[in-house]
Interface confidence: medium
Amino acid sequence: FAPVPRLTWEHGEVGLVQFHKPGIFNYSALLMSEDKDTLYVGAREAVFAVNALNISEKQHEVYWKVSEDKKSKCAEKGKSKQTECLNYIRVLQPLSSTSLYVCGTNAFQPTCDHLNLTSFKFLGKSEDGKGRCPFDPAHSYTSVMVGGELYSGTSYNFLGSEPIISRNSSHSPLRTEYAIPWLNEPSFVFADVIQKSPDGPEGEDDKVYFFFTEVSVEYEFVFKLMIPRVARVCKGDQGGLRTLQKKWTSFLKARLICSKPDSGLVFNILQDVFVLRAPGLKEPVFYAVFTPQLNNVGLSAVCAYTLATVEAVFSRGKYMQSATVEQSHTKWVRYNGPVPTPRPGACIDSEARAANYTSSLNLPDKTLQFVKDHPLMDDSVTPIDNRPKLIKKDVNYTQIVVDRTQALDGTFYDVMFISTDRGALHKAVILTKEVHVIEETQLFRDSEPVLTLLLSSKKGRKFVYAGSNSGVVQAPLAFCEKHGSCEDCVLARDPYCAWSPAIKACVTLHQEEASSRGWIQDMSGDTSSCLDKSKESFNQHFFKHGGTAELKCFQKSNLARVVWKFQNGELKAASPKYGFVGRKHLLIFNLSDGDSGVYQCLSEERVRNKTVSQLLAKHVLEVK
């Protein structure tokens, strides 16, 4: 299990910027316009545009309220007029440089509209949002805009019992088959498009990936066994001519594995997914947050998957088929029979075109019937190194974003920012042999779940934005200036931070104007380069005989041990003479002449089998 975060920052301790509008709740849709330096925020009955550099500066706002009549009709159907029968913004996607595509639950009558970014007004199109946006604000949803067409995963009816993955397109709308083998009570988490590789074969197609958790179709237990999935469809899919008419011909899904090797610890509830794309990466990497199905202990894990592994399962894996096996928990088994050509579920690529299959509309019925009956792959998608990147106890992770950053020595590190259901943000760096949890920041004053996380990693301007029920918070990727000494700065093992001996401060890397000459950073936590010992200061105290002295010591690191020394001997709390307050401050009881002298508070921190010792405070005590 991962260690506790080395540092804990309380809400008021660090520089966080907040945005919220009184009376507005559920800030759950965030969209960044990097070129405009604007963050768009979708909340309940409102959309805002705020300055991405300082989100407390609101630029525009527009309200989209539900009429009293609609509210009443919704309430008649047994829904809450005060909460459920409102308009929760669920889709906030870019349509063009001057407009956004916005959908809301609209009192259980999902509706979509175009938001003009110049006037910041809705165009009043009121398109039916069925299949694009959930009816119920409590139901899961995901969407991505690809080439002006909305790809969504949500529920298609009032009850939320008909799941759908669809493409809203004027010329070629497509959807999933309403059948349990395709989607079985899914909880949608994430969707994104992966563009064809520029080095890949000619005629490849872009693919849209959907991530969700669903009830297992392949196993049957006493309880509903949940299984995390990745599904994919091809952008060029146009449906079938007869079989699978107006349905996906390229819909395939596979199980995601995230488990601790050689233990029974299986993480099968998917919470969030982030696609890491970076110049140094050969291919995108999917980072995913999971919790176990029976999570009475508060466990969370992060697993990472390469695009190649996901693609391999869909392009070369075996299929599953429905089986009727008596006295067996297995309902689906591996299909070993002949597979039609072209391969079922494959995108129309140059190979297919060479065989005269120029579109999914002229695929043979055999291929279409096969994919209709076998949407589930037998092979599972396994994580990088066959194990989670991180397993954390006593926490329920909700969202994740990942930044790839270059340390002072030129090494690239993946830094994960993972939010919790109690309003905190954990920051963890993936090192060669371990994951180091750098810090935990309490983003929201109240312990409320983080609903959405967004990373803006524009050069020279990097922030994490978090949305919750009460508002949005903007946090920098590092709080380097909070590390007061060279040792603290290096022990943080934060790739964004380095110590500048010239200005005797911990500074943030990659600030355009700064020269990093002579800066000190060591991702193994080696502080031996920290030579500039700051001038020792001491606190002088005078106490009366028989009294009690309290000597203060402030230690931030949760991984360090505080040691008090008097005349070079370590003081133990076990003796009746001494006590500790909060494992840091020292109490000396029944003072006498022999207690006069120099008391030193040191922190001892184990890093890579070495103990780093730092003097935190020096107290000179005189008993009169």
Epitope: G264, V339, S380
Partner: antibody, heavy 122, light 110 residues
Framework: QVQLQESGAGLLKPSETLSLTCAVY????????WSWIRQPPGKGLEWIGE???????NYNPSLKSRVTISVDTSKNQFSLKLSSVTAADTAVYYC????????????????WGQGTLVTVSS | QPVLTQPPSASGAPGQTVTISCSGG????????VNWYQQLPGTAPKLLIY???LLASGVSDRFSGSKSGTSASLAISGLQAEEEADYYC???????????FGGGTKLTVL
């Protein structure tokens, strides 16, 4: 870290029964298939058969009539019996874990024992 | 006789690229994925490539795998002396309902 260790008689006479056991340390036993693979001196690898924690087996058709693989989940062990041995059965015998994700095509031998040499000689 | 066919030997000078082929049939390489193993003298085999072309954990990216139809191949670029070993391909065979190996290729670094 998972470790596999083979044990059993190293020298046999023709027509005897070869008997080997593989002990699995440091890992979960269920969820995997466990294989026996052999390698005659100076030759290539030959798969003998596999078993999972519940006793389900698959055998190499060419050896099927002489092979029995069994499992003891309480001890995290699995065993190989090869009857009526001849000099052609002289080989280094390896046990290995077959990792199955899904049911088969996504599979591989990810952990191996160090191997034990079995010699058949009169 | 091994079900999968590999050349018995291959060689290359340090720094060169060497390719080892593995030929099978429809019931094994054609429909199932191929794994490659390296066996250094006197040791047990070690997994190099799985699922046709995915690199096993801790293996140098100078090793790469590929597959087309019923043939697979292993390529080693920037050859190093310590890579002198036997290399085996393996796949599941649907007809035999079992694992099949190639006969192995002895790689010599000149």
């Amino acid at each position: 870290q998972v470790q596999l260790q083979e044990s059993g008689a190293g020298l046999l006479k023709p027509s005897e029964t070869l008997s080997l056991t593989c002990a699995v340390y440091g890992g979960s036993f269920s969820g995997y298939y466990w294989s026996w693979i052999r390698q005659p001196p100076g030759k290539g690898l030959e798969w003998i058969g596999e078993i999972n924690h519940s006793g389900s087996t698959n055998y190499n058709p060419s050896l099927k009539s002489r092979v029995t693989i069994s499992v003891d989940t309480s001890k995290n062990q699995f065993s190989l019996k090869l009857s009526s041995v001849t000099a052609a059965d002289t080989a280094v015998y390896y046990c290995a874990r077959t990792r199955y994700y899904g049911s088969g095509s996504w599979s591989l031998f990810d952990y191996w024992g160090q191997g034990t040499l079995v010699t058949v000689s009169s | 006789q091994p079900v999968l066919t590999q050349p018995p030997s291959a060689s290359g000078a340090p720094g060169q690229t060497v390719t080892i082929s593995c030929s099978g049939g429809n019931s094994n390489v054609g429909t199932n994925t191929v794994n490659w193993y390296q066996q250094l003298p006197g040791t047990a085999p070690k997994l190099l490539i799985y699922y046709d072309d995915l690199l096993a954990s801790g293996v140098s990216d100078r090793f790469s795998g590929s597959k087309s139809g019923t043939s697979a191949s292993l390529a080693i670029s920037g050859l190093q002396a310590e890579e002198e070993a036997d290399y085996y391909c393996a796949a599941w065979d649907d007809t035999l309902n079992g694992w099949v190996f190639g006969g192995g290729t002895k790689l010599t670094v000149l």
